[in-house]
Interface confidence: medium
């Protein structure tokens, strides 16, 4: 397993609708054709997998139908969007990139993007 540099923004603020987007960029040392991208969430020293997708270079990322993630790829960049976030989902979201094929296998893990989610204030009842 060989190491690979992965860059991602330090901080992102989710929208009022609970959507956060960030770019995950990897320094590809070879001509990878099959790439796997995994988003991990670290909170309270626990790491959980948020979503994962494998894509062939030049193709779209395909997450599972019930995934909260969507994404697009362009060269060595992956544009990730996480939906349905609430305040309790605030945490460090780490981008993990694996160059699956052809060998040699490369693994890169970013430093993480701190995503802040603020639940919108409920609309006050209004009398008409």
């Amino acid at each position: 397993c060989k190491a690979m540099h992965v860059a991602q923004p330090a901080v992102v603020l989710a929208s009022s609708r609970g959507i956060a987007s960030f770019v995950c960029e990897y320094a590809s040392p070879g001509k990878a054709t099959e790439v796997r991208v995994t988003v991990l969430r670290q909170a309270d020293s626990q790491v959980t997998e948020v979503c994962a997708a494998t894509y062939m270079m030049g193709n779209e990322l395909t997450f599972l139908d019930d995934s909260i993630c969507t994404g697009t790829s362009s060269g060595n960049q992956v544009n990730l969007t996480i939906q349905g976030l609430r305040a309790m989902d605030t945490g460090l979201y780490i981008c993990k990139v694996e160059l699956m094929y052809p060998p040699p296998y490369y693994l890169g893990i970013g430093n993480g993007t701190q995503i802040y989610v603020i639940d919108p204030e409920p609309c006050p009842d209004s009398d008409f």
């Epitope: 001509k31 099959e34 052809p102 040699p104």
Partner: antibody, heavy 122, light 111 residues
């Protein structure tokens, strides 16, 4: 269903070249690597190399670098292997095979053509 | 290049008994996550057929009497109980690195 179609046989003169074809159907050709494997009569399997139709990237075993050239034609979903300067040592069955997604299968070849038997004889 | 050594070269097994085929790599073909070893069956005049991938995963449509195990450098293919249609040559193949290599093959005969 996935199919890799190869001609049954080729008869070639020593010193000549031959271009073997592998016509793919039943899947997205540009998404999967195609491998080529040699099998001499009564012998085992030898990996020649592979090619990725999506980007024309290819790899070869060192001993086949000057013998084989791998190409693809994405418009017809076909992979080709040209063998040059043929000798009796090149008489063999040549298979093309599809590499299953590495993430799922780890480098196994899930579909194979029936092979082309190449006979080098004057 | 990694060399794969299969043993035995040939094997005669009675119907209903167990056939065990070994494949040894000259260096590890495993990582912390996967064992990059696969098994194929080839009958005369036919192309190889994938039986087991990643050391122990049964390919779709392959009978459950076929099983694979092992990690690192030592891998095993078991067939139990052996049936007449299992008479064939079996090959191991590695994919940890390029070039891919195959074992020399084991010819299984049923008596």
């Amino acid at each position: 269903q996935v199919q890799l179609q190869q001609p049954g046989s080729e008869l070639v003169r020593p010193g000549a070249s031959v271009k073997l074809s592998c016509k793919a159907s039943g899947y997205t050709f540009t998404n999967y690597w195609v491998h080529w494997v040699k099998q001499r009569p009564g012998q085992g399997l030898e990996w020649i190399g592979n090619i990725f139709p999506g980007s024309d990237t290819s790899n070869y075993d060192e001993k086949f670098i000057s013998k084989a050239t791998l190409t693809v034609d994405t418009s017809s979903s076909a992979a080709y292997m040209q063998l040059n300067s043929l000798t009796s040592e090149d008489s063999a069955v040549y298979y093309c095979a599809r590499l299953a997604y590495f993430t799922n299968y780890g480098g196994a070849m899930d579909y194979w053509g029936r092979g082309t038997s190449v006979t080098v004889s004057s | 290049d990694i060399v794969l050594t299969q043993s035995p070269a040939s094997l005669v097994v009675s119907l209903g008994q167990r056939a065990t085929i070994s494949c040894r790599a000259s260096k590890s073909v495993s990582t912390s996550a996967y064992n990059y070893m696969h098994w194929y069956q080839q009958k005369p005049g036919q192309p190889p057929k994938l039986l087991i991938y990643l050391a122990s995963n049964l390919e779709s449509g392959v009978p459950a009497r076929f099983s694979g195990s092992g990690s690192g450098t030592d891998f095993t293919l078991n067939v139990h109980p052996v049936e007449e249609e299992d008479a064939a040559t079996y090959y191991c193949q590695l994919s940890r690195e390029l070039p891919y290599t195959f074992g020399g093959g084991t010819k299984l005969e049923i008596k």
